[in-house]
Interface confidence: medium
């Protein structure tokens, strides 16, 4: 399955409006940093299947737009920046969505790759576990912003190994 | 691909009332609202309600007194209710599948030309 | 609610030509929240552009959209057949209803 053009394109504008959230100096809340234990073994370049990596990614983007959908994102967060953020989130899951039932096939479910996913899954339990420790604080979700940030280029990174491997 | 498959009648009796079932098939891998939108040719593309991934809906007020949708997530399964048909209610409706409540729509049911006349 | 006027209502150009049509709401609408879709007869509306100026999965580059409060526009920089169709922009924000506009319908010389 090849990913359009306008993906890759949509990541880039997923990523700039991250950087755009940004309300506050990451310096002011460098007490409040936390290792979020990104699965980064998800992510590097181990033999995957194509279908495996598409359902990682697609796991990725999905637990971010949730995370970022909240009413408690709407009080912390500029609300248009968040509704282009949504938009971008919703034309990547459905290009994923797309290649995926094109690589697995309706048949096959992404369960196969259950280990990948939860592991994504946990990761984002991790971070909303914080948040509300944290109070869902302004430092807090400057922290998480950063975080987002640097899955997502990770995440973008494994789409453009997959791009290049075709 | 994702795929919206819609089925019921084309022709309604004034006065009578409309249903129409959406199935959702492909691997549906998110929450999502199923949005029900119609074309008829005076009034063009109108919006009449959503039931969201959680079951609360939103409706048109215009509709509101006579519409109603219901889900049956266990069959991908979303159905759309609408009484008291009158001839101008004659049009084209449409499921068609949004992820937030404010993202366009990439996915449409191919349509149910429905008629409303004696 | 918000209204939604497109111009013209119906329109017709020569293949290679540059084609312009408008949409203007009744209230001003974040760029954000404006949608544009194509739809051919006898098929349901298709996404072409999201968010004002977005192409969607698959659409051809010869399509732009631009714009921002009460104004906006398609594009299509080098009119082919295929593109004969009606467009209709569309707007949603949050509070329903969402709404749609009357449609231009692109016809070829």
């Known amino acids: 399955c090849d990913l359009p053009q306008t993906h890759s394109l949509g990541n880039r504008r997923a990523l700039i409006l991250l950087a755009q959230m940004r309300r506050i100096s990451p310096f002011s809340c460098l007490k409040d940093r936390h290792d979020f234990e990104f699965p980064q073994e998800e992510f590097d370049d181990k033999q995957f299947q194509k279908a495996q990596a598409i359902s990682v990614l697609h796991e990725m983007i999905q637990q971010t737009f949730n995370l970022f959908s909240t009413k408690d994102s709407s009080a912390a967060l500029d609300e248009t920046l968040l509704d282009e953020f949504y938009i971008e989130l919703d034309q990547q899951l459905n290009d994923l969505e797309s290649c995926v039932m094109q690589e697995v096939g309706v048949i096959e479910s992404p369960l196969m790759y259950e280990d990948s996913i939860l592991a994504v899954r946990k990761y984002f339990q991790r971070i909303t576990l914080y948040l509300t420790e944290k109070k869902y604080s302004s430092c807090a979700w400057e922290v998480v912003r950063a975080e987002i940030m640097r899955s997502f280029s990770l995440s973008i990174n494994l789409q453009k190994r997959l791009k290049s491997k075709e | 691909q994702v795929q919206l498959k819609q089925s019921g009648p084309g022709l309604v009796q004034p006065s009578q009332s409309l249903s129409i079932t959406c199935t959702v098939s492909?691997?549906?891998?998110?929450?999502?609202?199923v949005h029900w939108i119609r074309q008829s040719p005076g009034k063009g593309l109108e919006w009449l309600g959503v039931?969201?991934?959680?079951?609360?809906?939103d409706y048109n007020a215009a509709f509101i007194s006579r519409l109603s949708t219901t889900k049956d997530n266990s069959k991908s399964q979303f159905f759309f209710k609408m009484n008291s048909l009158q001839a101008k209610d004659t049009a084209i409706y449409y499921c068609?599948?949004?992820?937030?409540?404010?993202?366009?729509?990439?996915?449409w049911g191919q349509g149910t030309l429905v008629t409303v006349s004696a | 609610q918000i209204v939604l006027t497109q111009s013209p209502t119906i329109m017709s150009a020569s293949l290679g030509e540059r084609v312009t049509m408008t949409c203007t709401a009744s209230s001003s609408v974040s760029s954000t929240y404006l949608h544009w879709y194509q739809q051919k007869p006898g098929s349901s509306p298709k996404l072409l552009i999201y968010s004002t100026s977005n192409l969607a999965s698959g659409v051809p580059a010869r399509f732009s959209g631009s714009g921002s409060g009460t104004s906006y526009s398609l594009t299509i920089s080098n009119m082919e057949a295929e593109d004969a169709a009606t467009y209709y922009c569309h707007q949603y924000h949050r509070s329903p209803p969402m709404t749609f506009g009357g449609g231009t319908k692109l016809e070829i010389k």
């Open positions: 068609a599948r949004g992820r937030g409540n404010y993202v366009p729509f990439t996915y």
């Open positions: 039931i969201w991934s959680g079951g609360n809906t």
């Open positions: 492909g691997i549906s891998l998110t929450s999502y609202g």
